[in-house]
């Protein structure tokens, strides 16, 4: 049987993806990180 | 608030067509993810789904009843109309339309039902 | 097509006890998105049918909480913790996740 029609089961959330440089002073150079929806991943 | 009617003749013979219309308000079929549906009950029996037509003029048919059937919608007019082919006296039911709406944010059920119209099929 | 069978047909029940409906499918309806398309339909007398459940076991608004739909693959239940006089009428199943939509037999509670 063919299937009736409905949306996908899950929800796309849009989110900013912001790179960030961090200075750490003079210690190891800087932090490079990747924030996405508040979160640091890298 | 939302409100679904359906309209057409009480009485057709055996080998006519009939035609149903179903006059809503409370919402559009231009909205994204809106649909209207139709099924029929007969007499003291259990509901038959018929046919669902979608916002973008998708149109879904019962498999057993799809070459006599025809769904449309007039947006305009707030109207889907259903014409359903070469009637026999076990096309008698009382026909609903029904809205659905697609969408994560939607119930995606039949939410809203029309009052039904009755239809006999005699000679 | 999809068979929904119900059980029982017929369900007399005292107000204020429980009521439980079966309503099985021939085969499983669950739809590729991953949701499963199980809705319940009160049909009371003289009256449209109106939804109470949608997706296995979500209450349609202004539902009472004494109904609870639950259930997976092709076995689902309906049940009414406290049976009051209004709920009277034909109970309804119905897959939506395969073409045609099918509807059960349909159960008809009745007040003892």
């Known amino acids: 049987d063919a299937e009736f029609r409905h949306d996908s089961g899950y929800e796309v959330h849009h989110q900013k993806l912001v790179f960030f440089a961090e200075d750490v002073g003079s210690n190891k150079g800087a932090i490079i990180g990747l924030m996405v929806g508040g979160v640091v991943i890298a | 608030q939302v409100t679904l009617k359906e309209s057409g003749p009480a009485l057709v013979k055996p080998t006519q067509t009939l035609t149903l219309t179903c006059t809503f308000s409370?919402?559009?079929?231009?909205?994204?993810?809106?649909?209207v549906g139709w099924i029929r009950q007969p007499p003291g029996k259990a509901l038959e789904w018929l046919a669902h037509i979608w916002w973008d003029d998708d149109k879904s048919y019962n498999p057993s009843l799809k070459s006599r059937l025809t769904i449309s919608k007039d947006t305009s007019k707030n109207q889907v109309v259903l014409t359903m082919t070469n009637m026999d006296p076990v096309d008698t039911a009382t026909y609903y339309c029904?809205?659905?709406?697609?969408?994560?944010?939607?119930?995606?059920?039949?939410?809203?039902w029309g009052q039904g119209t009755t239809v006999t099929v005699s000679s | 097509d999809v068979v929904m069978t119900q059980s029982p047909l017929s369900l007399p029940v005292t107000p204020g006890e429980p009521a439980s409906i079966s309503c099985r499918s021939s085969?499983?309806?669950?739809?590729?998105?991953?949701?499963?398309?199980l809705e319940w339909y009160l049909q009371k007398p003289g009256q449209s049918p109106q939804l109470l459940i949608y997706?296995?076991?979500n209450r349609f608004s202004g539902v009472p909480d004494r109904f609870s739909g639950s259930g997976s693959g092709t076995d689902f239940t309906l049940k009414i913790s406290r049976v009051e006089a209004e709920d009277v009428g034909v109970y309804y199943c119905v897959q939506t996740s395969l073409v045609p939509l099918t509807f059960g037999q349909g159960t008809k509670l009745e007040i003892k």
């Open positions: 085969q499983s309806i669950l739809h590729s998105n991953g949701n499963t398309y």
């Open positions: 997706k296995v076991s």
């Open positions: 029904a809205r659905r709406q697609l969408g994560l944010r939607s119930i995606d059920a039949m939410d809203y």
């Open positions: 409370g919402f559009s079929l231009s909205t994204s993810g809106m649909g």
